[in-house]
């Protein structure tokens, strides 16, 4: 079966709709919003989970400083163009023929403009920096079992090798996760860092796009580890072009 | 098609290494994990490490407590695995595998490398 | 390390034979097990990926189901040439990845 092997679901995507018309019967899933098959052994591309969700009813000194030009989402929602391979399309534009430029995982890197605004290619995020604050402890976590378990959940939850987990730093309470993933070291079946760090942001928010599992249970040697806020920066291979007046 | 091949039988001392190689040829040797994996003879497999061509990057078995290195050569689409200090408990046949980021399937496999260690 | 536990480690069947191989985890691994064939004398082959996933050229009379810690192995009608041993492996966690002892599948 293509997605879960006895009740046709998708394990990774909540926001699919399945049924059992794949080659043979297979149980085969398809994303809200765009129709697209997804491989539910693995997360589904940030596009086409954006894709579903605008489709949805509505209801200190070793802690990395952001570099000048890290990106932050503060835009927010939006529905998005995606590629054939559920990949963000360059150029983004609203209904209102506003539109903008965005890199990998979606997040705008230019001012807006009108139809007239070219994006010549997709800028590729290689660098992500999740930064999180927890809810006081007794004591401190202690640093080496914090990465572990951080490297841990980033692989067995959102199958992202460790190899892609640059760094955990922390500075109670504190916790910095960086991801590093260039275009050349992705080999075939790795995850992409900028969806691994979208699934991890939703689990954190309580919002979680894995079917039937769990809400994310971080422990470090049986602590609980709950996260007050997340800020996540978003480096990308070219830096971005904003105007002077946004700056100010 | 796809296939890995592999560098001849070898006899080693107690003490010696070995360096193994895997040739790889029909897909591109950078996109693909690769792995090594041994059978000693009428047991079962035991993995020892992996290695990403396009970085070099390499994880191991801890089992084999920095005997074990793995690298690459992406002129040739080669890679190579080195053991250290051999016993003769590292008597084997040793494999490389094309490997899989998500499912950490083997899909392809080298035919083989013997390696005897013996006084 | 997650422990992979193959049963039986041996068995007899003769050729027409349904025949059902188990493999079981130490714990959860989801459904990323794989399963292999493995002839005296040659590498393993790829059989089933991520616990069902038939690997391109296997016959269908392979099939793989489970999830979880239970995972089983099936060949619905054996064939002459089917006679080997079977591998089960794990790729969930962090490394190690770990294989079971394996199962030899013999002619009655």
């Known amino acids: 079966h293509t997605a879960a092997q006895d009740n046709c679901t998708c394990p990774t995507n909540k926001m699919t709709v399945c049924s059992p018309d794949g080659p043979g019967g297979r149980c085969q899933c398809r994303a809200l919003g765009s129709g697209m098959a997804v491989d539910c052994s693995t997360l589904t591309s940030k596009c086409l989970l954006l894709k579903a969700r605008m489709s949805a009813p509505k209801n200190a000194r070793t802690l990395v400083r952001p570099s000048e030009h890290a990106l932050v989402d503060n835009d927010g929602l939006y529905d998005p163009d995606c590629d054939p391979e559920g990949r963000f399309k360059a150029r983004q534009c609203n209904q209102t023929s506003v539109c903008w430029c965005v890199n990998s995982v979606g997040v705008r890197r230019t001012d807006k403009g009108d139809l007239s605004l070219r994006c010549d290619e997709l800028v590729r995020t290689h660098h992500i920096l999740i930064d999180l604050r927890h809810r006081p402890t007794a004591g401190a976590f202690n640093h080496s079992d914090l990465d572990a378990e951080l490297r841990r959940l980033f692989r067995e939850r959102y199958r992202l090798h460790p190899k892609f987990v640059a760094a955990v730093h922390y500075e109670q309470p504190t916790i910095q996760i960086e991801l590093r993933q260039n275009t050349s070291q992705k080999a075939a079946g790795d995850v992409d860092i900028g969806d691994a760090a979208y699934y991890f942001e939703r689990d954190i928010k309580g919002e979680s796009l894995f079917q039937g599992r769990g809400g994310l249970d971080l422990r470090v040697r049986g602590e609980p580890l709950q996260v007050e806020r997340t800020l996540i920066y978003y480096l990308d291979e070219i830096p971005p072009k904003f105007s002077m007046k946004r700056l100010t | 098609q796809v296939q890995l091949v592999q560098s001849g039988a070898e006899v080693k001392k107690p003490g010696a290494s070995v360096k193994v190689s895997c040739k790889a040829s029909g897909y591109t040797f950078t996109s693909y994990w690769m792995h090594w994996v041994r059978q000693a003879p009428g047991q079962g497999l035991e993995w020892m490490g992996e290695i990403t061509p396009s970085d070099g990057y390499t994880s191991y078995n801890q089992k084999f407590k920095g005997r074990v290195t793995i690298t690459r050569d992406t002129s040739t689409s080669t890679a190579y695995m080195e053991l250290s200090s051999l016993r003769s408990e590292d008597t084997a046949v040793y494999y490389c595998?094309?490997?899989?980021?998500?499912?950490?399937?083997?899909?392809?496999w080298g035919q083989g490398t013997l390696v005897t260690v013996s006084s | 390390d997650i422990q992979m536990t193959q049963s039986p480690s041996s068995l007899s069947a003769s050729v027409g034979d349904r025949v059902t191989i188990t493999c079981r985890a130490s714990q959860d691994i989801s459904n990323y097990l794989n399963w292999y064939q493995q002839k005296p004398g040659k590498a393993p082959k790829l059989l089933i990926y991520y616990a069902s996933r038939l690997h391109s050229g296997v016959p269908s009379r392979f099939s793989g189901s489970g999830s979880g810690t239970d995972f089983t192995l099936t060949i619905s009608s054996l064939q002459p040439e089917d006679f080997a041993t079977y591998f089960c492996q794990q790729g969930y966690t962090l490394p190690p990845y770990t294989f079971g002892q394996g199962t030899k599948l013999e002619i009655k």
């Open positions: 595998a094309r490997g899989h980021g998500n499912y950490v399937s083997f899909d392809y």
